[in-house]
């Protein structure tokens, strides 16, 4: 039975084989089924000790829950057993493999993934609420600059239709708990809420149940105060690059600041041998302001296209505001194409990174 | 602006692979899905897959799982898309698309047209 | 796999009149679909996702609405540069599938 992406109904006590790392795979069990899942170390190495997590909690071994290495069983399974299970290296909490698993009301009927009848296929069996797209339901911090719009959404299905309601810090919420209000939007599976402040920090749970169960995802939402400061640039951008001749290159600068700020890319350069001015400011060239037409978003990436020898060097964003500057630099070095490194290497030449 | 900018055309052999790029620009890769669409001549679209460029995380349409393999280098904000054992089926337009977060394909690639003949 | 349903592969229109294509899905998609327009020769351009929301920078005279398994793109005032194929797309649950596509066209 076809259940679309990597989704299959699995029988009882099926053992099912891990995802390449970075795959998800979408598992549908039945209820009192044994779900196994197995996760066997990337490139048949060794794996170092895992640990296996349900909804980004551990899970702690029971009578029912049998944990391993490389594999999880969970016996008699249950609506409650339906989320998303991941197995990481304990140390660096790196995922080796994710799976999705929903277990739905009867009990499934042995593994037919080969079947052309897309019929069973229709959604309308009974079952526990599931998410529609488990594979987006992983961005769960989400930090704004006040007055923004905040969307949550938890899309999801099940049979009955399941019912969505919101809790923030694990208390029901409602319009009137906030200045502004919200807006539900029950059919798109989303809340909504416009001109955030600094009070509507905290966790936002959705709550989406059935009869046959209830799932749940929680989002931290962290509202960035806008207080008088020069912009602030995210760390590590734009980041050092190496091209080759002829290529295109992209720097990038993300800019936070509450007043309007004001970015250009600047390309150090020198001047009769000399990089700075006699008063020891730098000599630069203007690459790109702002426009008419130009978004801040925009202004956020500097493209260079079909580099030349002459576009290596330091490059600078440069974020004003009423209150100041920040600046962020990056190197571009550029190296000859892979031709000419073949003829120098023939004439004897050694190219230093 | 923004825009994906993908390989050009390609003739293969059947029984070969072609891996087929996708490069983004105007924006910041992580902050989008990237999907891939495949549209056989004069004939509707079909989802391929998605990739999520922040950890890699792939989702396959279940059709395509055993044919595509969807990879992504964040580091020149390019995602690929590789397939395998092609056959004269394979012949399509193959379109990368980005989504963010459950919102619809707001911006797609120009397209690459993969031919597949002896 | 949800399938999405476009009933008519032609329409044919005038500039000026109301035109609206229409689009059904085998189950209820709870509003997660998407309108697309594609020219000959062009990539699809978004238009419309979650049944009613305009994609920036489309005119108001695009607008979708439809709930459950029915939804509807309708183009209030054709012009000429409207002439094109039109594909809907649930974007609800995986796989996402599209419809066959309805080709706006002159009588």
């Known amino acids: 039975e076809s259940l679309g992406t990597e989704q299959r109904v699995v029988g009882r006590a099926a053992e099912v084989p891990g995802p390449e790392p970075g795959q998800q795979e979408q598992l549908v069990f039945g209820s009192g089924d044994a779900v196994e899942l197995s996760c066997p170390p990337p490139g048949g190495g060794p794996m170092g000790p895992t640990v296996w997590v349900k909804d980004g909690t551990g899970l702690v071994p029971s009578e029912r829950v049998l944990v391993g290495p490389q594999r999880l069983q969970v016996l008699n399974a249950s609506h409650e057993d339906s989320g998303a299970y991941s197995c990481r290296q304990r140390l660096t909490q790196r995922v080796l493999c994710h799976f999705s698993v929903r277990v739905t009301d009867a009990p499934s009927s042995g593994d037919d993934e080969d079947g052309e009848d897309e019929a069973e296929d229709t959604g309308v069996d009974t079952g526990a609420p599931y998410w529609t797209r488990p594979e987006r339901m992983d961005k769960k911090l989400l930090a704004v600059p006040a007055a923004n719009t905040v969307r949550f959404r938890c899309p999801a299905a099940g049979n009955p239709t399941p019912s969505i309601s919101w809790l923030k810090n694990g208390r029901e919420f409602r319009g009137e708990h906030r200045i502004g209000g919200i807006k539900l939007r029950h059919q798109q599976w989303s809340l909504v809420m416009e001109s955030v402040v600094p009070s509507d920090r905290g966790n936002y749970t959705c709550v989406v149940e059935n009869k046959f169960g209830s799932i749940r995802q929680t989002y931290t939402l962290d509202v960035l105060e806008r207080s008088p400061h020069r912009p602030i640039l995210q760390a590590g951008l734009p980041a050092n690059q190496t091209a080759v001749l002829g290529s295109d290159v992209e720097f990038h600068c993300k800019v936070y600041s509450d007043a309007q700020p004001h970015i250009q890319w600047l390309k150090h350069v020198e001047v009769n041998g000399s990089k700075v001015g006699p008063d020891g400011t730098p000599y630069v060239t203007v690459l790109k302001t702002a426009g008419a037409n130009t978004t801040d978003k925009e202004l956020e990436v500097l493209s260079l296209h079909n580099v030349t020898f002459e576009d290596a060097g330091e490059y600078t964003c440069l974020a004003g505001n009423s209150i100041g500057f920040s600046h962020h630099s990056a190197w571009l070095v550029v190296l000859p194409a892979e031709e000419e490194l073949v003829e120098a290497d023939e004439a004897g030449s050694v190219y230093a990174g | 602006e923004v825009q994906l900018q993908q390989s050009g055309p390609d003739l293969v052999k059947p029984g070969a692979s072609v891996k087929i790029s996708c490069k983004a620009s105007?924006?910041?890769?992580?902050?989008?899905?990237m999907n891939w669409v495949k549209q056989s001549h004069g004939k509707s679209l079909e989802w391929i897959g998605d990739?999520?460029?922040?950890?890699?995380?792939?989702t396959y349409n279940q059709k395509f799982k055993d044919k595509a393999t969807l990879t992504v280098d964040k580091s020149s904000s390019t995602a690929y898309m590789e397939l395998r054992s092609l056959t004269s089926e394979d012949s399509a337009v193959y379109y990368c698309?980005?989504?963010?977060?459950?919102?619809?394909?707001?911006?797609w690639g120009q397209g690459t047209t993969l031919t597949v003949s002896s | 796999d949800i399938v999405m349903t476009q009933s008519h592969k032609f329409m044919s229109t005038s500039v000026g009149d109301r035109v609206s294509i229409t689009c059904k899905a085998s189950?209820?998609?709870?509003?997660?679909v998407a309108w697309y327009q594609q020219k000959p020769g062009q990539s699809p351009q978004l238009l419309i996702y979650?049944?009613?929301t305009r994609h920036t920078g489309v005119p108001d005279r695009f607008t979708g609405s439809g709930s459950g398994t029915d939804y509807i793109l309708t183009i209030r005032s054709v012009q000429a540069e409207d002439l094109a194929l039109y594909y809907c797309?649930?974007?609800?649950?995986?796989?996402?599938?599209f419809g066959a596509g309805t080709k706006l066209e002159l009588k």
């Open positions: 698309a980005r989504e963010e977060d459950f919102d619809g394909f707001d911006y």
């Open positions: 105007g924006y910041t890769v992580t902050d989008y899905y």
């Open positions: 990739i999520n460029p922040n950890n890699g995380v792939t």
């Open positions: 189950q209820d998609v709870s509003t997660g």
């Open positions: 979650w049944a009613s």
């Open positions: 797309q649930q974007h609800y649950s995986t796989p996402l599938t």
